[in-house]
């Protein structure tokens, strides 16, 4: 029961986390800056992984996508890649974990197969969460670097004078969404890995066969063992003493004087 709960909770937590990673990737508020506040209107600029937007206090918002001619930094491309890899891995992990859920029966799927699928999805969630956390952290580092490098200056360009205003970008809501979502996916993955241990079969009984000796003496064959997976608490090898040429699972209807029961 505890295993099913752990697996189910891990799945739900990961699902929320991956939904958050997708939301963060699509959000425009990765970085924000208040441009100025004049008597006419307050203007805000916020930038995401895919486009930049300007919003006025009147509610008017205009967004423009990034184009290659703007020469996007390699770091931004790296963040995009990390987030997409995180989403893809997370989505595959979710798909695998649905079939791995103990509460869902698909044909005659073995518990060992479910355990393996749970472990696979768990690892995928962990990597997905790490990708998201890494992506958001790289972007945050870009903002911090940009914050300290921003300066106001003036120069003459083509067509007239050009002035740069000292405006600084700060952390947007998407960064916090990304960090939390990445953390949840990571936690969900760990829970799935823990659930995998409990899902693995406790004991697998192998039919051990021992034979009679030619005389009236009892033959002891040390071959009869119960093999354990190592996941369960019972890891002791149990010797089976059997004088007859019978398998361990057979019922002894008429015990002979040579049998040790």
């Amino acid at each position: 029961m505890a295993v099913t709960a752990c697996q189910g909770l891990g799945f739900v937590v990961s699902l929320i986390g991956i939904a958050g990673i997708i939301a963060a990737t699509c959000m425009d508020q990765w970085s924000t800056q208040d441009l100025y506040n004049n008597p006419v209107t307050a203007v805000f600029n916020y930038q995401g992984l895919w486009r930049s937007c300007v919003r006025e206090s009147s509610g008017f918002t205009e967004c423009r996508g990034y184009f290659t001619l703007l020469g996007l930094p390699a770091m931004l491309q790296a963040v995009r890649a990390l987030m997409i890899v995180g989403i893809v891995l997370g989505a595959i992990g979710l798909l695998v974990s649905i079939f791995a859920l103990k509460c869902i029966r698909i044909g005659s799927m073995e518990d060992s197969a479910k355990a393996n699928m749970t472990l696979t999805s768990g690892i995928m969630f962990i990597v997905s969460g790490l990708c998201a956390i890494a992506g958001v952290s790289v972007f945050a580092n870009m903002l911090v670097t940009n914050f300290w490098m921003s300066t106001a200056n003036m120069y003459t360009g083509m067509g007239g004078m050009v002035q740069t205003v000292q405006t600084r970008y700060t952390f947007g809501a998407a960064l916090f969404v990304g960090w939390v979502a990445g953390g949840l996916t990571l936690i969900g993955g760990v829970m799935m890995c823990i659930a995998c241990r409990g899902l693995a079969p406790e004991e697998t009984n192998y039919k051990a066969v021992s034979y009679h000796a030619s005389g009236h003496s009892v033959a002891y064959k040390p071959g009869g063992f119960k093999a354990s997976t190592g996941f369960g608490s019972n890891t002791k090898n149990k010797k089976i003493y059997d004088g007859g040429a019978r398998t361990e699972d057979e019922v002894q209807s008429y015990p002979s004087k040579h049998d040790y029961v």
Partner: nanobody
Framework: AVQLVDSGGGLVQAGGSLRLSCAVS????????MGWYRQAPGKQRELVAT???????NYADSVKGRFTIARDNAKNTVYLHMDALKPEDTAVYYC???????????????WGQGTQVTVSA
């Protein structure tokens, strides 16, 4: 590179009208505001009118009711309709645009070369 091309200036009689236009060209992310400033000989450059992309406008007290600023967001162009012109309106009119040039780049103020408006008495 971003370029502002202003045009429409000239010589006009007092009480007459003119229309100035300014187009932004080049690669950039967002235009925040566009507007017009003027500089009369021996004077400081002063605000005439500005507009945001959303249509919020701001006028200098001296031109209120006479000048109208309009924009065409699709063409990234701003217009200044000047009516009831006075001799004191004589100046070089400069187009101005506040632009975010690229990703995580600072707000940049671009200026046009200026167009001369002369109002004769």
């Amino acid at each position: 590179a971003v370029q502002l091309v202003d045009s429409g200036g000239g010589l006009v009689q007092a009480g007459g009208s003119l229309r100035l236009s300014c187009a932004v060209s080049g690669s950039f992310l967002n235009i925040v505001t566009m507007g017009w400033y003027r500089q009369a000989p021996g004077k400081q450059r002063e605000l005439v009118a500005t507009t945001t992309r959303g249509g919020s406008t701001n006028y200098a007290d001296s031109v209120k009711g006479r000048f109208t600023i309009a924009r065409d967001n699709a063409k990234n162009t701003v217009y200044l309709h000047m009516d009831a012109l006075k001799p004191e309106d004589t100046a070089v009119y400069y187009c101005n645009a506040e632009i975010i040039p690229g990703f995580l780049q600072q707000l940049t103020l671009y200026w046009g070369q200026g167009t001369q408006v002369t109002v004769s008495a």
